[in-house]
């Protein structure tokens, strides 16, 4: 029950996170005009990954797309790439995780397959979240650098009494949306990975029964367990408890976590 809840919650959190990453990527307010020097500007500028906008005194907002690909800064291209990779990985992760959900029955899908799919989607969510956080952080770093550079050049070109103020940009709402969304996707991915641990099929634990055959005393245990106590020579290079995903072969070779109480 706890595993299903963890997996379901992980899925929902990741879903919200990826929706947020998509929203942030599409938003125009990645950078907004810093109003410190001109708090009463009638012309307000803000920029996104795909276009820049100007809101005028009339209340009208005009947005123009970046119609060039080669003329854009490499950093902006990198941020775009990171956000798109994050969205794509997240979307694939969501698709995989839908089929991995314990509450959804699809044919005769093995629990081990669901566990693998849960782990795969979890890893995808983690990478997706990291991509979004990295993309937003790169953009934020670019803004901070440009902000201080433009501050240093603030009053260059001052001709006598005439004041020419350079437009500076600060963090826009999309950056905060991106950071939060990336974090949520990351958390959702971790939850999926945690859920995977409990999803691996567990054997029905029968107590070992001794059958006395003529001249031999051999202990048998259903399910092909060898050296049920875990002290046999075949276990010397293996962990008794594995926290990660198990392959179908490994599931047969390891003691169940309920063997030791």
């Amino acid at each position: 029950m706890a595993v299903t809840a963890c997996q379901g919650l992980g899925f929902v959190v990741s879903l919200i996170g990826i929706a947020g990453i998509i929203a942030a990527t599409c938003m125009d307010q990645w950078s907004t005009q810093d109003l410190y020097n001109n708090p009463v500007t009638a012309v307000f500028n803000y920029q996104g990954l795909w276009r820049s906008c100007v809101r005028e005194s009339s209340g009208f907002t005009e947005c123009r797309g970046y119609f060039t690909l080669l003329g854009l800064p490499a950093m902006l291209q990198a941020v775009r790439a990171l956000m798109i990779v994050g969205i794509v990985l997240g979307a694939i992760g969501l698709l995989v995780s839908i089929f991995a959900l314990k509450c959804i029955r699809i044919g005769s899908m093995e629990d081990s397959a669901k566990a693998n799919m849960t782990l795969t989607s979890g890893i995808m969510f983690i990478v997706s979240g990291l991509c979004a956080i990295a993309g937003v952080s790169v953009f934020a770093n670019m803004l901070v650098t440009n902000f201080w550079m433009s501050t240093a050049n603030m009053y260059t070109g001052m001709g006598g009494m005439v004041q020419t103020v350079q437009t500076r940009y600060t963090f826009g709402a999309a950056l905060f949306v991106g950071w939060v969304a990336g974090g949520l996707t990351l958390i959702g991915g971790v939850m999926m990975c945690i859920a995977c641990r409990g999803l691996a099929p567990e054997e029905t634990n029968y107590k070992a029964v001794s059958y006395h055959a003529s001249g031999h005393s051999v202990a048998y245990k259903p399910g092909g367990f060898k050296a049920s106590t875990g002290f046999g020579s075949n276990t010397k290079n293996k962990k008794i408890y594995d926290g990660g995903a198990r392959t179908e072969d490994e599931v047969q070779s390891y003691p169940s976590k309920h063997d030791y109480v």
Partner: antibody, heavy 115, light 113 residues
């Protein structure tokens, strides 16, 4: 076509208040801010403030701060400008202005402040 | 506040003349966000509301005759009427549309010589 129709001329006593209305038609009222500009006889045009009909957000010229209040009734596509504590120097023609580039002006409302 | 200074305050000209009105702002009206200068020119006739002629310093409003042209950038702007027509005799105002409070020039009264 886009049109702004203002209320009629007003004569007020010093210390009184005046409320001028401006009815908009021919465009979506909430698409543009509504500005108010006045012109005293023989003087330059003077911006008083504006209102964003979407959220009721306002910005006023510091010169009129505390005396001017701009409001809107979006259901009636009408903007209002109220100026209180009237003085003789407030005698002017008051205009409402809207659309992009502030292209459309009302016909003007003459407010006379006289004792 | 941005101060707008217009010159001359009045001028006399004849029909067919080329007229230039200048406007200077105390701060730059150039917006780097869209590379536009937020200066507007209006024409006002006695007893009438101002009429928009030019926005963004040089873009003519639709319906405005081509004899009206605007130029300039930053803090210095000009309005030129290439060949004066009888209906052009009026008062012309420049306006800062870049920063609140929006401010207007003192006006240039164009009279018949």
């Amino acid at each position: 076509q886009v049109q702004l129709v203002q209320s009629g001329a007003e004569v007020k006593k010093p210390g009184a208040s005046v409320k001028v209305s401006c009815k908009a038609s021919g465009y979506t009222f909430t698409d543009y801010n509504m500005h108010w500009v006045r012109q005293a006889p023989g003087q330059r045009l003077e911006w008083m403030g504006y209102i964003n009909p979407n959220n009721g957000g306002t910005s006023y010229n510091q010169k009129f701060q505390g005396r001017v209040t701009i409001t809107v009734d979006t259901s009636a596509s009408t903007a209002y400008m109220e100026l209180s504590s009237l003085r003789s120097e407030d005698t002017a023609v008051y205009y409402c202005v809207t659309t992009r580039y502030l292209a459309v002006w009302g016909q003007g409302t003459t407010v006379t402040v006289s004792s | 506040d941005i101060q707008m200074t217009q010159s001359p305050s009045s001028l006399s000209a004849s029909v067919g003349d080329r007229v230039t009105i200048t406007c200077r702002s105390s701060q730059s009206l150039f917006n780097s966000g869209n590379q536009k200068n937020y200066l507007t020119w209006y024409q006002q006739k006695p007893g009438k509301a101002p009429k928009l002629l030019i926005y963004w310093a040089s873009t003519r409003e639709s319906g405005v005759p081509s004899r009206f042209s605007g130029s300039g950038s930053g803090t210095d702007f000009t309005l030129t009427i290439s060949s004066l027509q009888p209906e052009d005799f009026a008062t012309y105002y420049c306006q800062n549309d870049y920063s609140y409070p929006l401010t207007f020039g003192g006006g240039t009264k164009l009279e018949i010589k």
